[in-house]
Every structure is written in structure tokens, then in C-alpha cells.
């Protein structure tokens, strides 16, 4: 499966965080959603293996991801604000 | 191609306000932060706040009773004001996109404050 | 807020020798695993600063003869505290001030710069 870290995390507000994701072996496909508390799933970034296919709602001021070697993927928010409590998916496709 | 171009004055007297305003081009201010750095005559650089992208605004601790920072983003402006100047507050002062990809990746060209009587 | 101390102010270093600039972080500037918060900063009289490493990333365009390592003193959680901008072999064009920042934390602080001199 999709493995994340860390599960959880705890940050003081204007602080950065970072997650990390490594997608099912072989899916070329990558995804970062963000799931605040009582709402859905928000598309933040998609990747085609290495590159970003969509990224309209990734506020590029403070959020960044990428992925290298078409592989893992990292997800920065740098520094983060009390909005962005959430529970942050990365979801993998073919 | 992105710029950002600053207008203020030169010469402010102690006690009066600094008010620059910083015009974008080349990017959305919905999409990115500016940010306000100033350099004090053979000092360092200093940073002063920020506007971000959704308007939010956050200043340094020495700054915050005096410094102002707001923006319209229809008319791709962000205003920067600091009140109750005093001499050692002459310093360039830089407006600087940033984006966590590319950190300060371009700056206006600077507006050179002198206060003095 | 978080200090970061660089050293030296100045050096001069002669034409094709290493320059070595420290910037040391009261606390931590990493996020998570090895990704940095701490970047580095090359200003040249009269024109605002440039970007040379984003993080521990090298700026597009920027020579390969800079380069950016952090010591081994860290703190007792394994989080670096002490980078070094390296520059070798430095070039005439190498002469500036150099600040290292950092974005882990707002508010944002800077170095207080090195002034670098070429001989």
C-alpha cells in the first residue's frame, strides 16, 4: 500500500512541517490531498511521475511538493498557519 | 516576466510614516506572498513581514506596534507603512515575492529612506 | 525567534583558493528527515540579494563551485545546527556579502552576513 510519515504531528502555528509519501511500487501517478475536520478531500497536487499535472489549489506562498525520481514525494507547508490543521492523504495510481 | 515595482519617498522627518507601495506584475498576489526586507546603511539585511497569498499578514516582534502591511489584489498592489519613524529606521527597504519552491526569487529594486531633521 | 550567527564578518581569500562561510542556528532549521529550512544568500553592492541554495538545493544557474554542508553538531534529537557555505575555487566574480537565512519559524531571520574579498 501507500506508506505515509509521519502519522501524526503536532506544530506550533508559524512553524514548517513536512510529510512524506511513498505510492504503491510501479503507479506512476501521485497524489496530495488535504481533509480538514467535517469537510472532503481538496486535490492540493497531482503528479505524472515526476512531473505536476495540477496544482490550482496548493497555495504556492507557503505549500510546496515534489517528487523525485518519479518515486516518494514530499509535501512542505512552510511555515504553517492554524487553517492548515488537517489530515493530509497521498493517495498513488497507475 | 515577473517584476515588482516600489514607490516611496526619500527623505521623511523623525515621527512621520514611511509608506511604499509595491506593484506586481507577471504573478497573481492570490497565489503568492510578498514579503518586506530592509537594509540598514553598512548593516545586514533585516526582515520586516509579510502579506500572504489569502491576506494574511505577519510581522517581526521589534516591528509590530508600528508596521503595517495590506494589499489589493485587483490592483496587483501591496502597501507597506511603518509609523513613528526614527534615524535609525533609514535603511533600503526591498519588497520580495516569495514561493516555498524558489524561496525570495524576485525583489523590487529598493527604496533608499533617509530620516532626518 | 531564532538566531543565526555567521562567521566570519570578512575574509579575503586569494584567486583560486576555498572560501568557507559558517551560519550556526540557536535551533534547529530542519523539517523533516534532511529537508532544510536554512538558505543561502549572495548580495553584490547596489542590487538586492540572490538565492544560491534553496535549502540544500544549489539555485538553477548557480556554479557547481559552491557547495553547502552541515557539520556534525547537532542537537540531542539529531537536528542540524550548523551549516557551511563553501566556495571553491572562489573567482572575482565571487566578491560579495553572503547571508544565510532561515524560513523554518516566522519570523524570518537572516545572518548577519560575511563579506567576502577576493586577493
Known amino acids: 500500500g501507500v506508506a505515509q510519515s509521519p502519522r501524526y504531528k503536532i506544530i506550533e502555528k508559524r512553524q514548517s512541517v513536512a510529510f512524506w509519501c511513498n505510492p504503491i511500487s510501479g503507479h506512476a501517478t501521485l497524489y496530495w490531498y488535504q481533509q480538514i475536520l467535517g469537510q472532503g478531500p481538496k486535490l492540493l497536487i497531482q503528479f505524472q511521475n515526476n512531473g505536476v499535472v495540477d496544482d490550482s489549489q496548493l497555495p504556492k506562498d507557503r505549500f510546496s511538493a515534489e517528487r523525485l525520481k518519479g518515486v516518494d514525494s514530499t509535501l512542505k507547508i512552510q511555515p504553517a498557519k492554524l487553517e492548515d490543521s488537517a489530515v493530509y492523504l497521498c493517495a498513488s495510481s497507475l | 516576466q515577473v517584476q515588482l515595482k516600489q514607490s516611496g519617498p526619500g527623505l521623511l522627518q523623525p515621527s512621520q510614516s514611511l509608506s511604499i507601495t509595491c506593484t506586481v506584475s507577471g504573478f497573481s498576489l492570490t497565489n503568492y506572498g510578498v514579503h518586506w526586507v530592509r537594509q540598514s546603511p553598512g548593516k545586514g539585511l533585516e526582515w520586516l513581514g509579510v502579506i500572504w497569498s489569502d491576506g494574511s499578514t505577519d510581522y517581526d516582534t521589534a516591528f509590530i506596534s508600528r508596521l503595517s502591511i495590506s494589499k489589493d489584489n485587483s490592483k496587483s498592489q501591496v502597501f507597506f507603512k511603518l509609523n513613528s519613524l526614527q534615524a535609525d529606521d533609514t535603511a533600503i527597504y526591498y519588497c520580495?515575492?516569495?514561493?516555498?519552491?524558489?524561496?525570495?526569487?524576485?525583489w523590487g529594486q529598493g527604496t533608499t529612506l533617509t530620516v532626518s531633521s | 525567534d531564532i538566531v543565526l550567527t555567521q562567521s566570519p564578518a570578512s575574509l579575503a581569500v586569494s584567486l583560486g583558493q576555498k572560501a568557507t562561510i559558517s551560519c550556526k542556528a540557536s535551533k534547529e532549521v530542519t523539517i523533516f528527515g534532511s529537508i532544510s529550512a536554512l538558505h543561502w544568500y549572495q548580495q553584490k553592492p547596489g542590487q538586492p540579494p540572490k538565492l544560491i541554495y534553496n535549502?540544500?538545493?544549489?539555485?538553477?544557474?548557480?556554479?557547481?563551485r559552491f557547495s553547502d554542508s552541515g557539520s556534525q553538531n547537532r542537537s540531542p534529537f539529531g537536528n542540524q545546527l550548523s551549516f557551511t557555505l563553501t566556495i571553491a575555487p572562489v573567482e572575482a566574480d565571487d566578491a560579495a556579502t553572503y547571508y544565510c537565512?532561515?524560513?523554518?519559524?516566522?519570523?524570518?531571520?537572516f545572518g548577519s552576513g560575511t563579506k567576502l574579498e577576493i586577493k
Open positions: 520580495a515575492r516569495r514561493a516555498v519552491v524558489a524561496d525570495f526569487d524576485y
Open positions: 535549502g540544500a538545493k544549489l539555485e538553477s544557474g548557480v556554479s557547481a
Open positions: 537565512l532561515q524560513n523554518k519559524e516566522v519570523p524570518f531571520t
